[in-house]
Interface confidence: medium
Amino acid sequence: IVLRPSRVHNSEENTMRALTLKDILNGTFSYKTFFPNWISGQEYLHQSADNNIVLYNIETGQSYTILSNRTMKSVNASNYGLSPDRQFVYLESDYSKLWRYSYTATYYIYDLSNGEFVRGNELPRPIQYLCWSPVGSKLAYVYQNNIYLKQRPGDPPFQITFNGRENKIFNGIPDWVYEEEMLATKYALWWSPNGKFLAYAEFNDTDIPVIAYSYYGDEQYPRTINIPYPKAGAKNPVVRIFIIDTTYPAYVGPQEVPVPAMIASSDYYFSWLTWVTDERVCLQWLKRVQNVSVLSICDFREDWQTWDCPKTQEHIEESRTGWAGGFFVSTPVFSYDAISYYKIFSDKDGYKHIHYIKDTVENAIQITSGKWEAINIFRVTQDSLFYSSNEFEEYPGRRNIYRISIGSYPPSKKCVTCHLRKERCQYYTASFSDYAKYYALVCYGPGIPISTLHDGRTDQEIKILEENKELENALKNIQLPKEEIKKLEVDEITLWYKMILPPQFDRSKKYPLLIQVYGGPCSQSVRSVFAVNWISYLASKEGMVIALVDGRGTAFQGDKLLYAVYRKLGVYEVEDQITAVRKFIEMGFIDEKRIAIWGWSYGGYVSSLALASGTGLFKCGIAVAPVSSWEYYASVYTERFMGLPTKDDNLEHYKNSTVMARAEYFRNVDYLLIHGTADDNVHFQNSAQIAKALVNAQVDFQAMWYSDQNHGLSGLSTNHLYTHMTHFLKQCFSLSD
C-alpha cells in the first residue's frame, strides 16, 4: 500500500526539491495537535498562539480569555492549571527537568476573582509536584520529598509527611525506577473523586545501590550525580500506600492501605491506584517476578477510620506464557455501580481484549474478541464504552476509535473513525469531556495530522481544531519519500514492515538499505503515522531505502509474538531483523553490499547484536545509547522480561546475551558507538563496556560521546548527532558529500 505518493510529474520536477538535513534539524516540517483541556462536559481551555488562556464553550459557541498572556508573562509561566471551582489558576515557571517525566518548578497562584496573585503563605520553591483537588481549590504539593496540603491557596500549609529525604524517602513522587518503569508519571499521589481523601505512595530507597556518574559542567571539578537505581537482581525500593482525610488531616493522620497477603509474602511492586468513589479505592500490586498481578478493592471503614481490603475483592491476573499485561499491567475502568469494571487482558486465544469483571476474573465477560487487540479504554459512560483497537482491515499498526453501546442489549459496536478520512487518517487517539458529551479526535497519520471536535452522542464532527494547513503548504514543493506498509510471512511468523522509498524509486535499480530498529518488548515501530524525520531525509535526498520491521517481542499482534522473547532477550528480535533483510534482498532492488542497521536504546542493543551476528549482511551500523548487558539495566524493566540474574533462575542467558560476548564478530563491520555521559537511564557504563571489549579484542570501531547529555541527546547534541551519523552512513554507502 503506497501511503504517501510522491508528486513527481515532469512539469513539477523543476519546482520540487528534496528534503535537506537542515529541514529536519530545524523542525521545518513538524506538525501540531490540539488536545482540549476539558473543564466540564462542554467547555475546554486552550492556550492560543499568542499565549492567552482561552475558555471555549462548545454549546454557546462563545470564548473568552480567562488569563491574559501578560499575566502569564509576568511570572514567565510556561504552564497553568485552573482550579475546579474556577477561582484560581496556578502558573508554573522556572521549569527544571529531572528525569523522563519529573521536573521541579516555581508556582504562583493567581486569584481570578480579584485579578491578583495570592500573597501571603506563598508556595516554597522549587516544588516537585503540585495539583488541585478534583473539586474546589484545595492544593496538594510535594516539596523536598514531603507532601503538603492547603485548604485554600492563601492558607498556611498542613504538612502531611515528615520523613522525606533526598534519595532516601520519597513521598508523593516516585523514585527513579518507579517513575521510568512502573508509574510513567512524575507524581505518586491521587485525590479521591470529590477531594475528601488523598492517597499517596511512600518509596523507601535506603538500601538501593546507587549509580554514580560525573557531570562535567563548567567547574574545576566535575560533580557526581548519585541516583538510587536498582539494576537487575539488586535490592528494590520498598513501597507503602497511605490515605489521609483532607478535611480533618490532623484527626487520625495518614492510614496505610494493607498489601494483599499473596503479594506481601515476597518482593513486590505497587503498580497503580484508581479511585472508584470517595470511600472506595482500587490498588494494583505485582510480584517481583512479574507474572502475577493482584487488583485489590478497598473500602473506608468509618468506625475505625481505616481502609479495609477484603480477600473477596482481590482479583488475580496471572500469565503462564510470559509476564502479566503488555508493557504495563492494564488499569481498570469502573462502571457506574462502583464495583464492576472493564479491563484489558489476554483472552484464551492470547489476544488482549476488553473484559467485564463483575465478581471474579474467572467469570469475566469478554467484550471484544478477534485476532487483533484492544489497546486502550478511553471512557465508560452509562450507555457507551469508547476504546481503541487495531482491528480495522487487519493492520496492526493502525488505531481506530470504537464505541460499544453497553446500555442496550445486545451491545452493538460502531467504528467511529474508520471511514472519516480513510486515506489521511488511520491512527487516532481521543480526548473526552465529562460524561463524553464531546470528544476530540487526534489523527496522527499516515497523512498530515488533523484534530477535530465531535458530538459525543451522534459522533458528528463539529469543527476542525487543527489541520496543519501551513505544513501542508510547506510540503507542496517537497519530494517526500514513498511509504509502504506490508507484511512478510516467514515460518508461521508475520513480520510487518514499513519501507520508506526514494521519491523516484525504480524497482529495476539497486539502492542502499538502512534498517531502523527498536524491537523492545511490547513496542511497535510499524505504525501508520505521519513523520518527516531523519530517515525521510535519507530517502528523499540521499536515495536510501529505509525499513522498519516489527519482529517477535513486539506488541498488538497477540501473545505468541509478544511473549516469544520471554527470558530470551536479544535472540529472536535480532533473528527477525536478519530474516527481513534477506527477504528485502530477494525483492531485487537492494544493493546487498550496502546494507546498514541503526537503533537507539533497545534498538542500539539489537543493532549491535545484528552487526555482531556473523551473517555478513551488514556493512556498517550505529548504536546510540545501547544496553550492552541486561545486568546493567533497571530491575523493574529487565526482570519483567528476563527473570533474575541468579544461577537458579536465568543468569546463563543474562551472560550469553551481552554485546561484549560478541566483540570478535565486529571485526568485519564498521561500527559507530554513541552515548551521552550523563545518561541516567541506560548508563554510559553500557557503552564503556562495549568499547573495552572491542579494544581488548583489538577490533577497530568509531565512537562519539556527548558530555553531560542524557538518554535523549537533546539540544545542540541532536544536530551534531544526526550530522555525524549522516556522514558515517554516506561514507559507508560511498555516497558523495
Epitope: 473568552y64 480569555t65 509576568s74 476573582s113 485579578g115
Partner: antibody, heavy 121, light 107 residues
C-alpha cells in the same frame, strides 16, 4: 481592541456632586482591576482610586478619601466614580485605566481619552 | 507615602540621540516601577512595566533598568514621534505615586 470611554464630566459648583462612568470593551472586564487617574490642567498625573476585579477591594488617595467612591458593574462592563463634596482642586481631566496586576508589578496598561471635570462657582 | 523624583524636568535632544531619564524613589520599591509616555492632549501610554519589561507593541528602542530606589528609562535612538512627556510611577504600595514628569523637546 481594548477601548475605554469615559463620560459624566462637566462643570459643577464647589460642594456639588458628579458621577463619572467608564464603558469598557475589547477585554474581559470582570477579570481586571480598574483605576481612576487625574491630571490637573498643565500638571502631572495623580492616582485617584483603584478597584479589584470583583469589586471586593477598593483603594483611595488621601486627597479623595471619604468624598469619592469607586464601584463597578461587571454585568455592564462599566466602571464608576461617584464624586461628592467637590472642591476647586478636584478640577482635572479624569482618566479611567485598565489595571494589570502582575506578580511583581501593577500597572495601568490601557487608558481612556479622559473626561474633564471643572469645579468652579 | 513614597515620593518619586524624576530628573531632569525637561531636556532637549535631536533625532538619533541616545536619551536617559532617571527616577528615584524615596524608599526601596523593588522592581514595582512603570514608565508612561504622554503627548499633548492625549492619554498616557504604558511603555515599560516592572522596571524593565517592554509593553507589547512598544518599539525596542525603549528600555528600562534599575531596582530598589534608582531607575532609568533609555531611548537608544530618538525618533520624531518620541518627543513627549515621560512619567515614572511606583506600584509598590498605595497611594500609587507618579514622578513630576520629564518633558522631552526637540533641540
Amino acid at each position: 481592541e481594548v477601548q475605554l470611554l469615559e463620560s459624566g464630566g462637566g462643570l459643577v459648583q464647589p460642594g456639588g456632586s458628579l458621577r463619572l462612568s467608564c464603558a469598557a470593551s475589547g477585554f474581559t472586564f470582570s477579570r481586571y482591576a480598574m483605576t481612576w487617574v487625574r491630571q490637573a490642567p498643565g500638571k502631572g498625573l495623580e492616582w485617584v482610586s483603584s478597584i479589584s476585579a470583583s469589586g471586593g477591594s477598593t483603594y483611595y488617595a488621601d486627597s479623595v478619601k471619604g468624598r469619592f467612591t469607586i464601584s463597578r458593574d461587571n454585568s455592564k462592563n462599566t466602571l464608576y466614580l461617584q464624586m461628592n463634596s467637590l472642591r476647586a482642586e478636584d478640577t482635572a481631566v479624569y482618566y479611567c485605566a485598565k489595571t494589570f496586576s502582575g506578580y511583581a508589578h501593577y500597572d495601568f496598561d490601557y487608558w481612556g481619552q479622559g473626561t474633564l471635570v471643572t469645579v468652579s462657582s | 507615602d513614597i515620593q518619586m523624583t524624576q530628573s531632569p524636568s525637561s531636556l532637549s535632544a535631536s533625532v538619533g540621540d541616545r536619551v536617559t531619564i532617571t527616577c528615584r524613589a524615596s524608599q526601596s520599591i523593588s522592581s514595582y516601577l512603570n514608565w508612561y509616555q504622554q503627548k499633548p492632549g492625549k492619554a498616557p501610554k504604558l511603555l515599560i512595566y516592572a522596571a524593565s519589561s517592554l509593553q507589547s507593541g512598544v518599539p525596542s528602542r525603549f528600555s528600562g533598568s534599575g531596582s530598589g530606589t534608582d531607575f532609568t528609562l533609555t531611548i537608544s535612538s530618538l525618533q520624531p514621534e518620541d518627543f513627549a512627556t515621560y512619567y515614572c510611577q511606583q506600584s509598590y504600595s498605595t497611594p500609587y505615586t507618579f514622578g513630576q514628569g520629564t518633558k522631552l523637546e526637540i533641540k
